[in-house]
Interface confidence: low
């Protein structure tokens, strides 16, 4: 017997559907209507035939009352080939829901997204996460998707993007976006970061995560942030192979005074890199290759320094307390 494709937990909180059959019974997903967290994995299916069964252009207001009654706050959709028209139809309907967090992963979006009709309402998401999503429209995908969202998005995460750079002239500002996560785009690099951080489109960013993005030096990242006018409070550069030295011909970069937390863990560092901000509250240098305790003049003024997982910290060696290195 084949297992049920959908499983709802005992608290009616989380519902996970794995549709792996070639001809799945999509009606099984109805058991998820009472769940707050819903995950739907389509087993790599092409959802093109769906367009024949649903009217993607129908006025979504006819479903408004039904959709408003759904408890879903977090929705994950994964592993499918989705026509852009179908995605837009779903977004139009979900605009009447109480959905706050949407995750799209392992999707191939085909075709172009139609423009937002005048009478349509955008989706009031606080969080949008995309992992391994490809778009037929290339660099303009973010601008196309953005028009279907209300401007209150707070968290945007884009991982394993096929085109991590955006068409900046088409993208509108994200006035409420406080967290941007571009981690797990190893081909991004510092030049790609400059292209992705569209100038003045991310005015409110507080947390910027760039784990495993092909960054080379903190100074190079500093230059990209300065060019874009992005001033995060917290910057995560962990899991990049960082160089400790700076190219002598490269201009010095002044870090924004807003930056108070910097994560340089798992960066393969054999010494504290040059060109760090002069003052930080938090500096994470854990799990690097530091063979000796850093000297005070090698470090920024730092309140909370994490050094665990480095070779010099053999058992019995004392870790300096936060603030004792100032």
């Amino acid at each position: 017997t084949t297992p049920e494709p959908c499983e709802l937990d005992d608290e009616d909180f989380r519902c996970v559907c794995n549709f792996s059959e070639p001809q799945p019974d999509w009606s099984e997903a109805f058991q998820c209507v009472s769940a707050v967290e819903v995950e739907i994995h389509a087993g790599g299916l092409n959802l093109e035939p769906f367009l024949k069964r649903v009217d993607a252009d129908a006025d979504p207001r006819q479903y408004a009352d039904t959709v408003k009654a759904l408890r879903v706050r977090r929705l994950t959709v994964g592993a499918a080939q989705v026509p852009a028209q179908l995605l837009v139809g779903a977004l139009r309907v979900l605009a009447y829901s109480r959905l706050k967090e949407l995750t799209l992963e392992d999707l191939k979006i085909t075709g172009t997204m139609p423009p937002l009709p005048l009478e349509a309402t955008g989706l009031a998401l606080s969080s949008l996460r995309l992992r391994n999503v490809s778009w037929a429209t290339g660099r303009s995908w973010l601008a196309e998707l953005q028009q279907w969202l209300k401007p209150g998005l707070k968290v945007l995460s884009i991982a394993q993007a096929h085109s991590p750079a955006f068409s900046c002239e088409q993208v509108r500002a994200f006035p409420a976006l406080t967290s941007l996560d571009l981690s797990d785009n190893p081909g991004l690099g510092e030049r790609g970061l400059m292209a992705a951080l569209c100038p003045h489109k991310f005015p409110a960013i507080q947390n910027l995560a760039l784990r495993n993005t092909g960054m080379e030096t903190p100074t190079g990242v500093c230059a990209a942030l300065a060019a874009a006018g992005v001033q995060p409070h917290s910057l995560d550069l962990s899991h990049n192979s960082l160089r400790a030295t700076v190219n002598p011909s490269a201009p010095r970069c002044m870090w924004s005074s807003a930056l108070n937390s910097l994560n340089l863990s798992f960066a393969g560092l054999e010494q504290v890199p040059k060109g760090l901000p002069a003052k930080l509250r938090v500096l994470d240098l854990s799990c690097n290759r530091l063979n000796r305790a850093p000297q005070p003049d090698e470090l920024p003024e730092v309140d909370n320094l994490t050094l665990d997982g480095n070779p010099f910290l053999v058992p019995g060696t004392a870790l300096p307390h936060e603030g004792s290195m100032n």
Epitope: Q206, N207, H233, S234, N260, S261, R281, V282, D303, N304, L305, T306, D308, G309, L313, P315, L319, H321, E322
Partner: nanobody, 122 residues
Framework: QVQLQESGGGLVQPGGSLRLSCVAS????????MGWYRQTLGDQREMVAT???????RYADAVKGRFTISRDNAKSAVYLQMNSLNREDTAVYYC????????????????WGQGTQVTVSS
């Protein structure tokens, strides 16, 4: 050994206020994220508010505008100021902290307090 000691719970009337405190003690080197979670009988523990070392706070929708989380990094302490309390806020409130500490070697893990009861009733 690291310990989290909560205090400040009690009985309060609807519309009233309480201030919860939690102090981490032991051989602590640094404290990362700290926060408050709550649990009612038979329910899952849910996040109320968290705050990172730099003071960036996150709140559950149900408490936004009523509760304020703060911390004193020097004291390894976190506080939760709860205003305009209502009956739905009745729960056991737990302190949580991500701590780098020294036992046999350096380690970092999440610690939980024993919990403090908050009852909102007239």
């Amino acid at each position: 050994q690291v310990q989290l000691q909560e205090s400040g719970g009690g009985l309060v009337q609807p519309g009233g206020s309480l201030r919860l405190s939690c102090v981490a003690s032991g051989n602590i080197r640094s404290v990362g994220d700290m926060g408050w979670y709550r649990q009612t009988l038979g329910d899952q523990r849910e996040m109320v508010a968290t705050i990172d070392y730099g003071g960036v706070a996150r709140y559950a929708d149900a408490v936004k505008g009523r509760f304020t989380i703060s911390r004193d990094n020097a004291k390894s302490a976190v506080y939760l100021q709860m205003n305009s309390l209502n009956r739905e806020d009745t729960a056991v409130y737990y302190c949580n902290a991500d701590i780098l500490y020294k036992s046999d070697s350096y380690a970092r893990r999440e610690f939980w307090g024993q919990g403090t009861q908050v009852t909102v009733s007239s």
